[in-house]
């Protein structure tokens, strides 16, 4: 039986040109996590596997870096980076848990650097 | 030039454990990658065995798991593979490879060259 | 496990033919998929990376693309040393599967 949830930091917005920190936690759950999958919309941004570290998808390599911890950091943002992002948990030996973040990149109002939006936390269980 | 090479008996009897090993050379096993075993059944496809990371944890296809244990000798620059409880579903080519997880994700950029291991009474 | 099924499983085409192979996931991979390249009684080679990346010193005829379930595999100009079989391999999950491969010959 799957008994985790995925926490995320939900709904965020961050200004054109600036970066942000994706980030999601797993809890209520003692199963092994091997892999977690970062992807926006239908692209593979990156995998970090538990034992062989961080792959970072080629076409995102000039602007996405990996962590801090499983998390991923989108930097200079463009409003094209507006949407859905999805942290994808995959242990053992529950099997797949989703969580979601919606971000929102917003035309710069003159000041640098990201701003953080509501934190809505989303509970997903299994994807597959 | 990394190159690895594929030895071991080329014929093990059932019920018995077959033993490989692979050599790794121009690159220290010690310093980066994964070191993975594949195999190739006679005229059908490819089959993950199995991986050795250079830390030293494994992880295991979940259908072989239970017979398959891969380790690292870093003494010799190279690892090995050990499945036991052999039947003739078993022979196959049995190549090693290396993994650059960072650089190409699961996919393997350096292959040995194969070595055929017929089980057979 | 994430099954790759290959179409077609053999196919005889002419040399400077555009040959296309397909590959189909059970379950969406994203981009995470490679392709090899096995001549007879060889080491597969590393030909694909991430769906769509070459890899280093493969020449520009390969080509990888498609993302999800459905990927294609192209020789733009098949050439006599391209006689090989191919083989498509995901990464999407910790356990690696590979296709049942596609052999190539010339017509």
């Known amino acids: 039986m799957m008994t985790g949830t995925i926490e995320t930091t939900g709904n965020i917005s961050a200004e054109k040109g600036g970066s942000i920190i994706l980030q999601c936690h797993l809890s209520s759950t003692t199963a092994q996590v091997t892999q977690v999958n970062w992807e926006q919309q239908d692209q593979l941004l990156a995998i970090c596997n538990a034992d062989l570290g961080w792959h970072i998808s080629p076409s995102f390599k000039d602007r996405v870096a990996p962590g801090p911890g499983l998390g991923l950091t989108l930097q200079s943002l463009t409003v094209n980076d507006t949407g859905e992002y999805f942290c994808i948990y995959h242990t053992y030996p529950d099997g797949t848990y989703t969580g979601r973040i919606f971000l929102e990149v917003l035309e710069s109002s003159g000041g640098g650097g990201a701003g953080g939006g509501g934190h809505h936390h989303h509970h997903h269980h299994h994807h597959h | 030039q990394v190159q690895l090479q594929e030895s071991g008996p080329g014929l093990v009897k059932p019920s018995e454990t077959l033993s490989l090993t692979c050599a790794v050379y121009?690159?220290?096993?010690?310093?980066?990658?994964?070191w993975h075993w594949i195999r190739q059944p006679p005229g059908k496809g490819l089959e993950w065995i199995g991986y050795?990371?250079?830390?030293?944890?494994?992880n295991y296809n979940p259908s072989l798991k239970s017979r398959v244990t891969i380790s690292v000798d870093t003494s010799k620059n190279q690892f090995s593979l050990k499945l036991s409880s052999v039947t003739a579903a078993d022979t196959a080519v049995y190549y090693c490879?290396?993994?650059?997880?960072?650089?190409?994700?699961?996919?393997?950029?350096?292959w040995g060259q194969g070595t055929l291991v017929t089980v057979s009474s | 496990d994430i099954q790759m099924t290959q179409s077609p499983s053999s196919l005889s085409a002419s040399v400077g033919d555009r040959v296309t192979i397909t590959c189909k996931a059970s379950q969406d991979v994203r981009t995470a998929v490679a392709w090899y390249q096995q001549k007879p009684g060889k080491a597969p080679k590393l030909l694909i990376y991430s769906a769509s990346y070459r890899y280093t010193g493969v020449p520009s005829r390969f080509s990888g693309s498609g993302s999800g379930t459905d990927f294609t595999f192209t020789i733009s100009s098949l050439q006599p040393e391209d006689i090989a079989t191919y083989y498509c391999q995901q990464y999407y999950s910790t356990q690696w599967t590979f296709g049942g491969g596609t052999k190539l010959e010339i017509k």
């Open positions: 121009g690159y220290s096993i010690t310093s980066g990658y994964s």
């Open positions: 050795v990371h250079y830390s030293g944890s494994t």
């Open positions: 490879a290396r993994m650059d997880y960072g650089n190409y994700g699961g996919a393997m950029d350096y």
